[in-house]
């Protein structure tokens, strides 16, 4: 005769308030005959939870008919599962006896925990930009997961970041746990269009992770190099001096010229083009009177970048003798 | 009718043992968890721990570990408490009652032993 | 564990008298609470299970009831066979602990 076995196979089972819970019990043998009761818990203050012989379990149904002759199979379902209901529940098999059942074998037991999502990780970066080449630190939340064990990932661009300190809350026990991360991250002068990502994994997602996101662009500043020259050609008695502002982001710019040392308010043509990297080039045109009593003429391209302090780019214009000629001619 | 009759009254020395019996009437002994109580001169009660004679499991509280030691014997239908390394401190009553195999609330602690008095003493 | 506070250790009433002990759970421990009374020979007998049923043989005149985590067992018209003692017992968690005992006294 074989030995009867009680097989409870999930040793941990997660459920969501509200939600139908379903406890696996089969057995492998019909001998000896008497009942299964569920149990949650042990030792003298075990509960009972199910007797289909005896008692009401309005939130209880079996999986079978437990009526059939052969039948092997008793597994429960718990209706409309609360907070109170978690804690590990057996199957037990009680042997026929007169004037009482005896209890005959247990199963291993099913610890049923409340599962509860984590919420939508917020990533949020650093409350000023910083540029290239310095540290920057973002942190990641998510709030209201059971159990406690989580697993957080940082990424930037695909590829796995190891700089970052994670904390849950809180450390005992509890019906929701909490989650943050501080990532650290070095700029690079590309990272206008990069993304860090932040990747939490849990139990209860079914191996989907849920991701919250951040783009470098927000945090990052790459300021500007200027370059001001001198167009070799003239037009007319005017002299095409140009302002290249390039590689800056963010796009807030403000660029004026001075002519030795006057603001010159005038208007100027100007483009604004967008670079692959995401940073951004300004060109500035400005013309320049010549006259013969003009020797000296020193202009200066100066730039306020994203409110930081002002850059500026002079150029003491070289006006050759054949174009004073020139301007001279032109001049009434 | 459900009873449980303890052994005498028991008079030990210090360093000794006692071994102190409970036996049931009156109902199926394998469905109900034995607990013993210790009552100690002019004080409260405090549980010991019970056993269950289905299988030998038992509980105890923390306080008594090492110190109470419970076994049964079911052909009899007979509760056993060991006391050992015995002390001033476990010159006590010692009480057994029952509880159903399950938490049921009308079957904690309906019936009670008469007590067996332990004196310890030089 | 969970402490039970039983207050108040001792009380002097008179015959006919209303009286009520309480114990105070440190912990939640829902209805899982006997009120046992013990007579001066130690005979030890249950009165109340669950909080508030009556066991079978007990008179009416006892009662238990409960407020959040105080319980209470109120006897409503003294009687002289009811000058003992009373304890309160929580089942709903190991180690199972009692109040610290009532003496009950006659004025």
């Known amino acids: 005769e074989e030995e009867l076995q009680m097989i409870q196979p999930e040793k941990l089972l997660l459920v969501t308030v509200g939600k139908t819970a379903t406890l696996h019990c089969t057995v492998t043998s019909l001998l000896p005959v008497g009942p299964v009761l569920w149990f949650r818990g042990v030792g003298p203050g075990r509960e009972l939870i199910y007797n289909q012989k005896e008692g009401h379990f309005p939130r209880v149904t079996t999986v079978s008919d437990l009526t059939k002759r052969n039948n092997m199979d008793f597994s429960i379902r718990i209706s409309s599962i609360t907070p109170a209901d978690v804690g590990t529940y057996y199957c037990v098999k009680f042997r026929k006896g007169s004037p009482e059942n005896v209890e005959f074998k247990s199963g291993p037991g099913t610890e049923m925990a409340l599962g509860a999502k984590p919420s939508a990780p917020v990533v949020l970066g650093p409350a000023a930009r910083t540029t290239p080449e310095h540290t920057v630190s973002f942190t990641c939340e998510s709030h209201g997961f059971s159990p406690r064990d989580i697993t957080l990932k940082w990424f930037k661009n695909g590829n796995e970041l190891s700089d970052f300190q994670t904390n849950v809350d809180p450390t005992g026990q509890s019906v929701a746990y909490s989650i943050r991360s501080t990532a650290r991250v070095v700029l690079d002068p590309w990272d206008v269009r990069s993304q860090v990502i932040c990747e939490v994994a849990h139990v209860t997602l079914q191996g989907d992770p849920l991701r919250g996101t951040a783009n470098l662009s927000e945090a990052i500043r790459v300021p500007p190099t200027l370059e001001v020259t001198q167009q070799p050609m003239r037009v007319g008695n005017q002299v095409n001096v140009t302002c290249q502002v390039r590689k800056f982001y963010p796009q807030s710019l403000q660029l004026t010229w001075s002519e030795n040392g006057n603001v010159c308010q005038r208007e100027t043509a100007s483009t604004l083009t967008e670079n692959k990297d995401g940073t951004y080039n300004w060109t500035s045109w400005f013309l320049v009177n010549i006259s013969d009593q003009r020797d000296d003429v020193v202009l200066t391209c100066q730039v306020k970048h994203d409110g930081q302090l002002a850059v500026s780019k002079r150029l003491a214009l070289e006006v050759t003798v054949h174009q004073k000629d020139q301007s001279s001619d032109a001049t009434p | 009718e459900v009873q449980f009759q303890q052994s005498g009254t028991v008079l030990a020395r210090p360093g000794t043992s006692v071994k102190m019996s409970c036996k049931a009437s009156g109902s199926t002994f394998t469905s109900y968890w034995m607990h013993w109580v210790k009552q100690g001169p002019g004080q409260g009660l405090q549980w010991i721990g019970a056993i269950y004679p289905v299988n030998n499991d038992t509980t105890y509280n923390q306080k008594f570990k090492g110190k109470a030691e419970l076994t049964v014997v079911t052909s009899t239908s007979t509760a056993y408490m060991e006391v050992s390394s015995l002390t001033n401190e476990d010159s006590a009553v010692y009480y057994c009652?029952?509880?159903?195999?399950?938490?049921?609330?009308?079957?904690?602690?309906?019936?009670w032993g008469q007590g067996t008095l332990v004196t310890v003493s030089a | 564990d969970i402490q039970m506070t039983q207050s108040p250790s001792s009380l002097s009433a008179s015959l006919g008298e209303r009286v009520s002990l309480t114990c105070r759970a440190s912990?939640?421990?829902?209805?899982?609470l006997n009120w046992l009374q013990q007579e001066p020979d130690g005979t030890i007998k249950r009165l109340i299970y669950a909080t508030s049923s009556l066991d079978s043989g007990v008179p009416k005149r006892f009662s238990g009831s409960r407020s959040g985590s105080d319980y209470s067992l109120t006897i409503s018209g003294l009687e002289s066979e009811d000058f003992v003692d009373y304890y309160c017992?929580?089942?709903?968690?190991?180690?199972?602990?009692f109040g610290g005992g009532t003496k009950l006294e006659i004025n």
């Open positions: 017992l929580q089942y709903a968690s190991s180690p199972f602990t």
């Open positions: 009652t029952r509880s159903f195999y399950y938490s049921l609330d009308a079957a904690w602690f309906v019936y």
């Open positions: 912990q939640d421990i829902g209805s899982r």
